[in-house]
């Protein structure tokens, strides 16, 4: 015979073809062997011009030989070489599918590999590729979009060889709150790291607000609206500044009275105050907290104290906000001017968390009267809020 070729090569099969001998022959003897693969010999009819090779090893170079027989006579042997394809990984599955994450798992191919190419694509056409190591059989996908169909494909690699791709389809879970209106909803969406988040006032995507979320204190879900920690920010600011907010939300800042009004108008909120000073800590929680609108001069409502810091905010309940340029307190003097800060002053304060950082003069510093009195400026203070029913929402999410 002549013209021995192989076609339709896969990871486990190939088709051998040849030109028949000119003379009539009784049979053809076919043998094939590969590295670490014992030789297999088959005899086929002399009328045959092709033979299907099966049960081959993947990613293996084979040597194929064929000769003709007629009675006791044997023709010369012709030879061809071919390499089987790299077999694909198996059983690609998406598990632990969440709104923004999923876990891909697979079984390795029979052949040894040098790595895997993972490709995942969303319906909107966003494609991401990643190459992982040869010993990997799972990969965590992150930063996925909620409520989105994905096609994930995997291909085994061995040097220049690439297997066929296998695929799986999955859909990420929809966010519980696509436009979270506060940090509690961001947390219930699965975000559990403290840091900067975008919330949407009243769930309106046009009303985006960047906030710092405390996701650790007492279960998390808190919008931080005041932080004092180092004295770098000037808190002796005017009415306009306190209405709008100022500072760096990762550092010292005030979120703004207009924002506080809009947030607390969304429902029933609770207030938490965390205080730290020279290794000591204290906190106060008020289960009812709201800030009125500009017409009320951002009137404070704060009720239902519990905690370790002492109930210093009760004195300020029902008061309007005061700054040095808008005196709404009940004192003859201007409290904000006298104590170089701003607050819901009365005459004047038991709480002065926007006072002068590090100033231990009477009533001038960062004060929480029932914890450290008026002659000690507290080193660290945060005021934060979350829905009063957060515990119920959290429980419902865990059960779900």
């Amino acid at each position: 015979p002549s013209g021995l070729v192989t076609a339709n090569i896969t990871d486990s099969e190939a088709l051998a073809r040849w030109q028949p001998a000119i003379a009539t022959v009784d049979s053809y003897v076919i043998s094939y062997t590969g590295e670490k693969v014992p030789e297999i010999t088959r005899t086929v009819s002399g009328n045959t011009v092709e033979y299907a090779l099966t049960d081959l090893e993947p990613a293996t170079e084979y040597t194929l030989r064929i000769f003709a027989e007629k009675g006791p006579q044997k023709s010369s042997t012709i030879t061809a070489k071919f390499t089987t394809d790299l077999d694909s990984p198996r059983d690609l599955t998406a598990t632990e599918v969440q709104s923004e994450t999923a876990l891909l798992t697979w079984r390795p191919p029979r052949a040894s590999v040098t790595g895997y190419l993972l490709v995942y694509e969303s319906v909107d056409g966003t494609v991401k590729e990643v190459i992982v190591g040869p010993d990997t059989t799972s990969y965590s996908l992150a930063d996925l979009s909620p409520s989105t169909h994905y096609t994930a494909k995997i291909q085994a690699l061995n040097g220049p060889l690439r297997s066929n791709m296998i695929q799986t389809i999955f859909t990420t879970i929809g966010l519980l709150y696509p436009f979270p209106k506060d940090c509690s909803q961001a947390m219930l969406n699965g975000d559990t790291t403290s840091g900067l988040y975008t919330i949407y006032l009243n769930g309106d995507k046009a009303e985006a607000l960047e906030v710092f979320c405390d996701m650790t204190s007492d279960g998390g879900g808190w919008i931080v609206f005041l932080r004092r920690k180092n004295g770098r920010e000037n808190f002796y600011q005017n009415w306009k500044a306190y209405a709008a907010g100022f500072g760096d939300r990762r550092e010292e800042f005030w979120l703004g009275l207009d924002n506080l009004n809009k947030i607390t108008a969304q429902g029933q909120y609770e207030l938490r105050v965390d205080l730290r000073d020279h290794g000591e800590t204290a906190f106060a929680v008020y289960d009812k907290f709201s800030v009125g609108d500009a017409k009320t001069r951002y009137k404070l409502k704060v009720e239902g104290y519990s905690g370790t810091a002492g109930d210093s905010m009760a004195y300020h309940n029902g008061r309007s906000f005061s700054t040095f340029d808008k005196d709404t307190d009940s004192a003859i003097t201007n409290c904000a001017l006298s104590y170089k800060g701003a607050f819901w002053y009365r005459n004047c304060h038991r709480v002065n968390l926007m006072g002068r950082y590090g100033d231990n003069n009477h009533s001038q510093g960062v004060n929480w009267f029932h914890w450290k009195g008026h002659e000690h400026s507290i080193q660290f203070a945060e005021m934060k809020l979350r829905p009063s029913n957060f515990r119920n929402l959290e429980g419902r999410r865990k059960r779900a």
């Epitope: 104290y305 109930d311 309940n317 029902g318 009940s330 005459n347 004047c348 009533s363 008026h374």
Partner: antibody, heavy 120, light 107 residues
Framework: QVQLVESGGGLVQPGRSLRLSCAAS????????MHWVRQAPGKGLEWVSG????????YYADSVKGRFTISRDNAKNSLYLQMNSLRAEDTALYYC?????????????WGQGTMVTVSS | DIQMTQSPASLPTPVGDRVTITCRAS??????LNWYQQKPGKAPKLLIY???NLETGVPSRFSGSGSGTDFTLTISSLQPEDFATYYC?????????FGQGTKVDIK
């Protein structure tokens, strides 16, 4: 209208006990801290004890600490002062008083008082 | 404890005159100062809170001023119904303490 009415006063021997009550009406009782203030015959006003709206925090003058106990029953809109080991110097007219807002604040509503006389 | 010192102890005054009572705290108390009026056989009545705020229903002839440690109660024109004993009280810290009282009587 907002009203406080004290009761439970009387004549008692030194070393004995007495329990004063104050019935509140006309306001949301558990929203406010409450206090007892006394006035010895012909003398000035002396703060005795205070209690937070929830009843979780209590405060006492040094002169009564360890002998008097303030308490409240918000379901009954009632304030109490349990007075043990009474002394002659505890003789006074005892007033219950409501604060304006916080624990340490002006007393905007007072009862008419109940007289306690400690004498053998 | 914060001591409150009132003066004078007694103030005989004719009807129509201006009355000034002072109260001094032994330490700085911001504006945590209240004034009460007490008539014989009656409970005290709040007149002024937070040093200068007139309680609802109290006549405008009463006024309060001061901050820190020194405070004043003023009756601009004494009326017959104003003859009583007046007490200042600090609500800055527990124990809340009262002044010893100033008796305003008819001259």
């Amino acid at each position: 209208q907002v009203q406080l009415v004290e009761s439970g006063g009387g004549l008692v021997q030194p070393g004995r006990s007495l329990r004063l009550s104050c019935a509140a009406s006309g306001f949301t009782f558990d929203d406010y801290a409450m206090h007892w203030v006394r006035q010895a015959p012909g003398k000035g006003l002396e703060w005795v004890s205070g209690i937070s709206g929830s009843g979780g925090s209590t405060y006492y003058a040094d002169s009564v600490k360890g002998r008097f106990t303030i308490s409240r029953d918000n379901a009954k809109n009632s304030l109490y002062l349990q007075m043990n080991s009474l002394r002659a110097e505890d003789t006074a007219l005892y007033y219950c008083a409501k604060v304006m807002s916080s624990m340490e604040d002006a007393f905007d509503i007072w009862g008419q008082g109940t007289m306690v006389t400690v004498s053998s | 404890d914060i001591q409150m010192t009132q003066s004078p102890a007694s103030l005989p005054t004719p009807v129509g005159d201006r009355v000034t009572i002072t109260c001094r705290a032994s330490q700085y108390i911001q504006g945590f100062l209240n004034w009460y009026q007490q008539k014989p056989g009656k409970a005290p009545k709040l007149l002024i809170y937070d040093a200068s705020n007139l309680e609802t229903g109290v006549p405008s002839r009463f006024s309060g001023s001061g901050s820190g440690t020194d405070f004043t109660l003023t009756i601009s024109s004494l009326q017959p119904e104003d003859f009583a004993t007046y007490y200042c009280q600090q609500s800055y810290s527990t124990p809340q303490t009262f002044g010893q009282g100033t008796k305003v009587d008819i001259k």
